[in-house]
Interface confidence: low
């Protein structure tokens, strides 16, 4: 009698099922009893002699590739032995490399959590998955894995992670880079310091006196707000950073505590007072401001 | 076997937006990337965009990046596709579509999203 | 983005004869690392979904049958239909997937 092994599917993609068969055309199983054994390479599969002549493979990987036979036994001890079956396990490459960050749209507060996930569209078995910074490409990390997707994490980001980053999949035919990402480092405003710049040492009543207020960390835009006490005098946008200045004309009112505030839409700042004192110094004829 | 059932037609007066589910039934969710395409009364298949479910990470089709925001909920094996701004030339058949290996093999049974004034 | 051109826009073709409709893409879907094309192709009847036909050019999906046949490399692309059947009238779409997907324009495939 003779035995024929049968794979199904014959040619079988990484990660799928194949079931081996143990066919035996000219004997019916009522014929005789018979015990199966199936075989890759020199080793014994599964659970080695079974009453079943079928073997399920859950899954199959590229180092499955090999050749496969199979046994029969009867109860009076005679063996039949398949002829060799050579089976193939192909290998899908990667294909459409992306890389997508969490949070999405890779805007990330300042000492946030920012997840790169490089993912692919299609490949198969172990895939390395490997993390650059920079056009020029330095080497962040790299992942093995039997997964489309991989993730690097910066758990703590500095305002120096501010980058375009990429990633690259590979899985034995070659690296597959996905586009660049660029990542936006958002930082909450510093508590802003207030300047009172006047034309001379000492301002007098019409002088014009420059507030000057300037956060000097913080992503821009900011926006900054003038106060003369708790009244507000008015606002200056920085657009693209920096401080602002705001022009008072001096009148004997404008003595007081003068502040400013600086937001960025992540936090608003409010800088120390600073006090402006209208005095008479002796012998002249008009009023000073002295701060 | 696998299921891809689409959210029922939808008729929007133009500026609105619509959202169109697609639940996935059969295989598992985040193990397949879901794209969404779209066909105009007598016209041809135009993609719009995809959803990697297990990492959340889209890629969109740059004629629809402004309008289109494509989500998936992992817990419900559900993939969203949401358009907004829409105008009468949006009047279609929106598809949902599994891929495997690049190809898409299972496709939803299509909602006709109808803009009119 | 890859330009998919497909060949006649409409075809009409006797009952038992062969049918043959041509794609070109804009630039080459072959792999040279696994000498395999990212092109598919659909079938699409009226108020129906497309039905994924083919991919990797050349492989039959399962369950469809044997008369239909994905021919072609690099940039030049076939779908043959050896047998035109009743229930083959439809629309024909190619695709490709090497990068985001864009897809052929469709042809027509009628009876004569």
């Known amino acids: 009698a003779e035995l024929f092994l049968i794979a199904s599917p014959s040619h079988p993609t990484e990660g799928s099922p194949v079931t081996l068969t143990c066919k035996m055309p000219f004997l019916q199983s009522s014929d005789a009893q018979f015990q199966f054994c199936f075989f890759r390479d020199t080793r014994a599969l599964g659970p080695g002699w079974s009453s079943s002549p079928k073997l399920q493979i859950a899954a199959m990987w590229k180092e499955d590739t090999g050749s496969y036979w199979c046994e029969a036994q009867t109860m009076a001890s005679k063996v039949l032995r398949s002829r060799r079956s050579q089976i193939n396990v192909h290998r899908v490459p990667v294909a459409d490399v992306s890389l997508e960050t969490q949070p999405p749209g890779g805007q990330v507060m300042e000492g946030d959590r920012l997840v790169l996930i490089c993912s692919v569209a299609m490949g198969t078995g172990d895939i390395t998955f490997l993390w650059y910074k920079g056009a020029v490409g330095l080497n962040l990390q790299s992942k093995t894995q039997r997964s489309l997707t991989a993730e690097y994490e910066i758990p703590s980001v500095r305002e120096s992670d501010a980058e375009q980053y990429y990633c690259v999949a590979e899985n034995g035919y070659g690296p597959s880079p996905s586009g660049l990402v660029s990542i936006t480092v958002r930082i909450p405003v510093s508590r802003p310091i207030l300047m009172l710049r006047a034309p001379r040492a000492q301002a007098a009543v019409e002088d014009v006196l420059e507030l000057h207020c300037e956060a000097l960390r913080g992503s821009p835009p900011i926006l900054y707000w003038f106060y003369h006490e708790d009244i507000t005098l008015g606002s200056r946008s920085a657009p693209s950073g920096g401080g602002a200045s705001f022009n008072l004309s001096l009148t004997e009112e404008h003595s007081g505590n003068y502040s400013c505030e600086a937001n960025n839409g992540l936090g608003a700042q409010r800088s120390e007072a600073v006090t402006l004192n209208f005095t008479v110094p002796t012998g002249a004829r008009s009023n000073h401001l002295t701060s | 076997q696998v299921q891809l059932v689409q959210s029922g037609a939808e008729v929007k007066k133009p500026g609105a937006s619509v959202k169109v589910s697609c639940k996935a039934s059969g295989y598992t969710f985040t193990r397949y990337w879901m794209h969404w395409v779209r066909q105009a009364p007598g016209q041809g298949l135009e993609w719009m965009g995809r959803i990697d479910p297990n990492s959340g990470g889209s890629k969109y089709n740059e004629k629809f990046k402004s309008r289109v925001t494509i989500t998936a909920d992992t817990s419900t094996s559900t993939a969203y596709m949401e358009l907004s701004s829409l105008r009468s030339e949006d009047t279609a058949v929106y598809y949902c579509?599994?891929?495997?290996?690049?190809?898409?093999?299972?496709w939803g049974q299509g909602t006709l999203v109808t803009v009119s004034s | 983005d890859i330009v998919m051109t497909q060949s006649p826009d409409s075809l009409a073709v006797s009952l038992g004869e062969r049918a043959t409709i041509n794609c070109k893409s804009s630039q080459s879907l072959l792999y040279s690392s696994n000498q395999k094309n990212y092109l598919a192709w659909y079938q699409q009847k009226p108020g129906q979904p497309p039905k994924l036909l083919i991919y990797w050019a050349s492989t039959r999906e399962s369950g469809v049958p044997d008369r239909f046949s994905g021919s072609g490399s690099g940039t030049d692309f076939t779908l043959t239909i050896s047998s035109l059947q009743a229930e083959d009238v439809a629309v024909y779409y190619c695709q490709q997937y090497s990068n985001y997907p864009t897809f052929g324009q469709g042809t027509k495939v009628e009876i004569k």
């Open positions: 579509a599994r891929v495997n290996s690049g190809a898409m093999d299972y």
